[in-house]
C-alpha cells in the first residue's frame, strides 16, 4: 500500500512539476523591468525566452518574437535548450510512469518490469527537474550579471543589436515558477525511485512453502509476517524453511514484499 501511495504521489508531484516547467517555458515574464529607479514609468517592459513585450499604462500590450537565432545571446539559447530537454524528458517520464503505476494493470506485466519502469521514469523526472532548475538559474545569473553591468554594449530586448541606454531587468514570475516546478519534478522523481525499491522483488530463490505441524495448517511466505500463532515474528525477511521443497511447477518466482497471507 505504501509503495502504491509513494508511486502515485510521485507521479502526481512530477505531473504538476512538468506542467509548471511547460508553463514557465511559455511565460513572457522571465525578466521584468526594474522599477526601482523609475517607479513612475508609463511603459513597462518584460521579456520571455521567445519574445519581448511592452505593456503601456493605457492597457495596450505589444509583444515581438525573437525572429533571429544567430542574433540571440548564447546563454538564452542554452536556457531554451535546457527547458526543452527538461520538458521532453519529463513528458517521456510521465508516459513511462503511467504504465509503471502499480494501480494500473496492463496484461500480465510483472512487478519487476514495473519496478524498472518506475526507476526509469524517476531518473527521467530527476534529470528533467535538474534541467529546469539549471535553465532558470542560468537565466537568473544572466540577469544579475546584466543588472550590474554598465548600460553600454548590451542587448536591448534579448534579440536586438541596437546599443542604447539599457532598461534594467530583474527576476520575473517565470523564474520562480520554474524553480518551484523543477523542484517538484525532482521531488517526484526521487519518490518514484523510492517506490521502485518497494516494487523490486526480494532476492530469494524459492516460493512459499507450506507444511503441516501438529494439526495446524501454517503457511509462510518469505518476508511475510507470521501466519499463525506459536512462532516468533519474522519481519526481517529471514528464511523460514531451508528444506528442498518447491512448488509444483518448480519455476522461480519473486513474491512482493507486501503479498501477505
Amino acid at each position: 500500500m505504501a509503495v502504491t501511495a509513494c508511486q502515485g504521489l510521485g507521479f502526481v508531484v512530477s505531473l504538476i512539476g512538468i506542467a509548471g516547467i511547460i508553463a514557465a517555458t511559455c511565460m513572457d515574464q522571465w525578466s521584468t523591468q526594474d522599477l526601482y529607479n523609475n517607479p513612475v514609468t508609463a511603459v513597462f517592459n518584460y521579456q520571455g525566452l521567445w519574445r519581448s513585450c511592452v505593456r503601456e499604462s493605457s492597457g495596450f500590450t505589444e509583444c515581438r518574437g525573437y525572429f533571429t537565432l544567430l542574433g540571440l545571446p548564447a546563454m538564452l539559447q542554452a536556457v531554451r535548450a535546457l527547458m526543452i530537454v527538461g520538458i521532453v524528458l519529463g513528458a517521456i517520464g510521465l508516459l513511462v510512469s503511467i504504465f509503471a503505476l502499480k494501480c494500473i494493470r496492463i496484461g500480465s506485466m510483472e512487478d519487476s518490469a514495473k519496478a524498472n519502469m518506475t526507476l526509469t521514469s524517476g531518473i527521467m523526472f530527476i534529470v528533467s527537474g535538474l534541467c529546469a532548475i539549471a535553465g532558470v538559474s542560468v537565466f537568473a545569473n544572466m540577469l544579475v550579471t546584466n543588472f550590474w553591468m554598465s548600460t553600454a554594449n548590451m542587448y536591448t530586448g534579448m534579440g536586438g543589436m541596437v546599443q542604447t541606454v539599457q532598461t534594467r531587468y530583474t527576476f520575473g514570475a517565470a523564474l520562480f515558477v520554474g524553480w518551484v516546478a523543477g523542484g517538484l519534478t525532482l521531488i517526484g522523481g526521487v519518490m518514484m525511485c523510492i517506490a521502485c525499491r518497494g516494487l523490486a522483488p526480494e532476492e530469494t530463490n524459492y516460493k512459499a512453502v507450506s507444511y503441516h505441524a501438529s494439526g495446524h495448517s501454517v503457511a509462510y511466505k518469505p518476508g511475510g509476517f507470521k501466519a499463525s500463532t506459536g512462532f516468533g515474528s519474522n519481519t526481517k525477511n529471514k528464511k523460514i524453511y531451508d528444506g528442498g521443497a518447491r512448488t509444483e511447477d518448480e519455476v522461480q518466482s519473486y513474491p512482493s514484499k507486501h503479498d501477505y497471507v
Partner: antibody, heavy 117, light 113 residues
Framework: QVQLKESGPGLVAPSQSLSITCTVS????????VSWVRQPPGKGLEWLGV???????NYHSTLISRLRISKDKSKSQVFLKLNSLQTDDTATYYC???????????WGQGTSVTVSS | DIVLTQSPSSLTVTAGEKVTMSCKSS????????????LTWYQQKPGQPPKLLIY???TRESGVPDRFTGSGSGTDFTLTISSVQAEDLAVYYC?????????FGAGTKLELK
C-alpha cells in the same frame, strides 16, 4: 462611437472643493484609462492625472495632495475632485480617453471652472 | 519631471509653405523594449479641445492628413507640415507619454501671414 462629456459647477469659491464628472460612452472604463487635463485661459495644457482600466491612478506631483480621481464603472463615469481651490485653478477642465502609446485619442468638449469669491 | 521645450513659440506662415516645429525633452523618451519614442503631438484650434495627430513620435492617427509628419528620437522631435492649409492654423502641443507626470510642452502657435 466614443464620446466623453464633462459636467462641472462653473463657479467655485476659493478654498472650496471642485467636483467634475466625466460621463463616457462607446468604450469600457474597465479596459481604458481616462486622463484629466486643464487649460487656464490663454495658456497651455496641463496634465492633472489619470485613472486606468484596472483602477490604479497617477497624479501630477504638484497636485498629489489635493487631487483625487475615481470612477463608477456601472454608470460609466469618472470623477475629479480637487480640494482647496485657489484662483489659479481657474481653467477649462477636459477629460480624455487614453489609447495607443498612452496618447489621448478622444477628448471631451471641456467644462469651464472659475474660482472666485 | 520631464520638461518639454517647444520652439518656436509662434510661427507665421503662408499657405502652401512647409513648416517644421521642434520639441526637446529633458530626458530620453525612447523605450528600449520596443524601440518606440513615447512622444505625442496634438493640434488645438481656438475654442476646441485638443486633437490627437501623432503618437509614438511618428505614427499618424487615423484620419489625420498625410501632410503631417512626426520624426525624431530620444530627446529631439520634430513635427512637419509639408504644405500648410488654412485649417491648420492652431496651437500644436507635444506631450511626454513615457513617464509620469505626462507633461505637455508650452505649445507652438501657427499663424497665417
Amino acid at each position: 462611437q466614443v464620446q466623453l462629456k464633462e459636467s462641472g459647477p462653473g463657479l467655485v469659491a476659493p478654498s472650496q472643493s471642485l467636483s467634475i464628472t466625466c460621463t463616457v460612452s462607446g468604450f469600457s472604463l474597465t479596459t481604458y484609462g481616462v486622463s484629466w487635463v486643464r487649460q487656464p485661459p490663454g495658456k497651455g495644457l496641463e496634465w492633472l492625472g489619470v485613472i486606468w482600466g484596472d483602477g490604479s491612478t497617477n497624479y501630477h506631483s504638484t497636485l498629489i495632495s489635493r487631487l483625487r480621481i475615481s470612477k463608477d464603472k456601472s454608470k460609466s463615469q469618472v470623477f475629479l475632485k480637487l480640494n482647496s481651490l485657489q484662483t489659479d485653478d481657474t481653467a477649462t477642465y477636459y477629460c480624455a480617453k487614453a489609447g495607443r502609446g498612452n496618447a489621448l485619442d478622444y477628448w471631451g468638449q471641456g467644462t469651464s471652472v472659475t474660482v472666485s469669491s | 519631471d520631464i520638461v518639454l521645450t517647444q520652439s518656436p513659440s509662434s510661427l507665421t506662415v503662408t499657405a502652401g509653405e512647409k513648416v517644421t516645429m521642434s520639441c526637446k525633452s529633458s530626458q530620453s523618451l525612447l523605450n528600449s523594449g520596443n524601440q518606440k519614442n513615447y512622444l505625442t503631438w496634438y493640434q488645438q484650434k481656438p475654442g476646441q479641445p485638443p486633437k490627437l495627430l501623432i503618437y509614438w513620435a511618428s505614427t499618424r492617427e487615423s484620419g489625420v492628413p498625410d501632410r503631417f509628419t512626426g520624426s525624431g528620437s530620444g530627446t529631439d522631435f520634430t513635427l512637419t507640415i509639408s504644405s500648410v492649409q488654412a485649417e491648420d492654423l492652431a496651437v500644436y502641443y507635444c506631450q511626454n507619454d513615457y513617464s509620469f507626470p505626462l507633461t505637455f510642452g508650452a505649445g507652438t502657435k501657427l499663424e497665417l501671414k
